[in-house]
């Protein structure tokens, strides 16, 4: 089987001339393409992967909402040679994007990372935007998180920052098959420079204090009962509240090495996507087709939006 292969971050990598073809390894009988688009009130971007896949042919479209950050996920798998270029990976212009002057700022101010690389979205480097209320929703919180897409033995991840409706969310996420949008929210001007280590404590909610059991018991029993602690708590704290509904997605540090495109362990190049870089061109039948005429992401109204944290 021969498939198209590319990895897109923001708007490079699946661009027209960068499309590759790869011969899939033995036993691989589907080509795959997956795209995840994230829409903030200040713009949108997408991540995408094309390559040799696994599983069965078919399509999966989903719309997700995380505190006013909208995510659209599409997966398409097919079993013919070079069939994995049917999804439109080009984004249409957002209504508010580029026209923010028409909206009244509500006083909140956040760092904005929309399609920026991890290097450009560190600390206070990214641009600052004024939040505004849109579509009857109040955007007064700031968000710091990641979008991650895994397909064709490749994982691509980009940071996401911007204005959201929630001001206190902690490590919240929404997921689709191989797709995760996760992060934390905060309140205050430019508070979303780095929320990786945000714990579940909130000024409005007193922390849950777990009292140590009486010391008459053997001390070794305490060490084994670690279910009440998680790695999400501050290093010196042994208490945290676990939110079972949230997606426990990794919230990659901007200070870590750039692992935005990761070839999964054990994956051979022939079995996955090759290439590097982000927005994709469209494929399809011969003939000049406008990108705007290609299949669109599911609209906000018609998209299936599961409960927060659901899949």
């Amino acid at each position: 089987l021969e498939c198209y292969s590319c990895v897109q971050k923001a708007d490079d990598g699946c661009s027209p001339h960068r499309m590759k073809t790869v011969k899939c390894g033995p036993g691989v009988d589907v080509c795959t393409e997956a795209v995840g688009a994230v829409e903030t009130i200040h713009g949108q971007f997408s991540v995408a992967v094309r390559g040799c896949g696994s599983g069965i042919p078919g399509k999966n479209d989903r719309g997700l909402d995380l505190h006013g950050l909208l995510a659209f996920f599409q997966l398409q798998q097919c079993s013919e040679d070079r069939c994995n270029a049917k999804l439109n990976l080009t984004l249409r212009g957002l209504n508010p994007a580029g026209n923010e002057s028409a909206y009244e700022p509500n006083g909140a101010e956040c760092y904005s990372c929309v399609g920026l690389s991890r290097e450009k979205c560190q600390g206070s480097m990214p641009p600052v935007v004024n939040c505004y209320n849109a579509s009857g929703r109040v955007y007064k919180g700031c968000f710091d998180g990641n979008v991650t897409l895994t397909a064709a033995n490749v994982t691509v991840s980009l940071p996401v920052r911007g204005c959201v409706q929630d001001e206190t969310c902690t490590r919240d996420g929404v997921t689709g098959p191989g797709f995760t949008l996760s992060g934390s929210c905060c309140q205050g001007p430019r508070c979303n420079a780095d929320l990786r280590n945000k714990t579940y404590f909130s000024p409005r909610i007193p922390p849950l204090v777990l009292l140590p059991p009486p010391t008459t018991a053997a001390p070794s029993t305490r060490a084994q009962n670690s279910s009440s602690t998680t790695s999400t708590a501050a290093p010196t704290t042994t208490t945290s509240i676990i939110k079972p509904t949230t997606a426990q997605a990794s919230h990659t540090s901007p200070h870590e090495m750039d692992l935005e495109v990761i070839q999964e362990e054990g994956a051979s190049l022939s079995g996955g996507a090759a290439g590097h870089g982000g927005t994709a061109g469209h494929g399809g039948a011969a003939g000049h087709q406008d990108r705007s005429n290609m299949e669109k992401y599911p609209g906000k109204g018609g998209a299936q939006i599961p409960a927060k944290g659901g899949s």
Epitope: D11, P16, H17, M19, L91, G93, Q289, R291, S292
Partner: antibody, heavy 117, light 112 residues
Framework: EVQLLESGGGLVQPGGSLRLSCAAS????????MSWVRQAPGKGLEWVSY????????YYADSVKGRFTISRDNSKNTLYLQMNSLRAEDTAVYYC??????????WGQGTLVTVTS | QSVLTQPPSASGTPGQRVTISCTGS?????????VHWYQQLPGTAPKLLIY???KRPSGVPDRFSGSKSGTSASLAISGLRSEDEADYYC???????????FGGGTKLTVLG
């Protein structure tokens, strides 16, 4: 109908500057990657520069790096090429081209840039 | 010197089949990047003839076909006509140069 119309070419002295424009119509410009490609008289095609749909990703050929700047104004459906420190070897017909279907699927008619003293 | 190598000229008589080769390297065609072909009629802008190795845009006759193998590609024109007299260029992305590269072009002459 897709149309690309270049303008801004002309005669310039070595070391001088020119700004080329390419007005696009008949397609959603803000969704398209665009490039400049040039052709010296009697010679072959040479890719010059590439810009992504949003303008955030840009590539240049080594021969023009540091001297030429590609940009776009999606609100005006226009692609630009600012050419500084021009040399005699930059003399060519400059085409703007749309990237679609994984290739340059539409080209303008070209604008001639002549660098001579 | 062009990154992709094409013969400078090719010729044939009407009705004949002509093939133009395009040889690249491991950083372009050999890296798996798809190959495109352009036709440039005298005094006009180039026109896309074949994209994605072997696909024809609408309006391009099926006399034109493309193929790719390893680090090279070829364009075949069957049933040659006088209006096919033009320059033909191949193109592909190049990882080393981080941009699309063209062949030097092949001038096709239709004899007789």
């Amino acid at each position: 109908e897709v149309q690309l119309l270049e303008s801004g070419g002309g005669l310039v002295q070595p070391g001088g500057s020119l700004r080329l424009s390419c007005a696009a119509s008949g397609f959603t410009f803000s969704n398209a990657w665009m490039s400049w490609v040039r052709q010296a008289p009697g010679k072959g095609l040479e890719w010059v520069s590439y810009i992504s749909s949003s303008g955030s990703t840009i590539y240049y050929a080594d021969s023009v790096k540091g001297r030429f700047t590609i940009s776009r104004d999606n609100s005006k459906n226009t692609l630009y090429l600012q050419m500084n420190s021009l040399r005699a070897e930059d003399t060519a017909v400059y085409y703007c081209a749309r990237e679609g279907l994984w290739a340059f699927d539409y080209w303008g008619q070209g604008t001639l840039v002549t660098v001579t003293s | 010197q062009s990154v992709l190598t094409q013969p400078p000229s090719a010729s044939g008589t009407p009705g004949q089949r002509v093939t133009i080769s395009c040889t690249g390297s491991s950083s372009n065609i050999g890296a798996g990047y798809v190959v495109h072909w352009y036709q440039q009629l005298p005094g006009t802008a180039p026109k896309l003839l074949i994209y994605d190795n072997n696909k024809r845009p609408s309006g391009v006759p099926d006399r034109f076909s493309g193929s790719k193998s390893g680090t090279s590609a070829s364009l075949a024109i069957s049933g040659l006509r006088s209006e096919d007299e033009a320059d033909y260029y191949c193109a592909a992305w190049d990882d080393r140069l981080n941009g699309p590269v063209f062949g030097g072009g092949t001038k096709l002459t239709v004899l007789g």
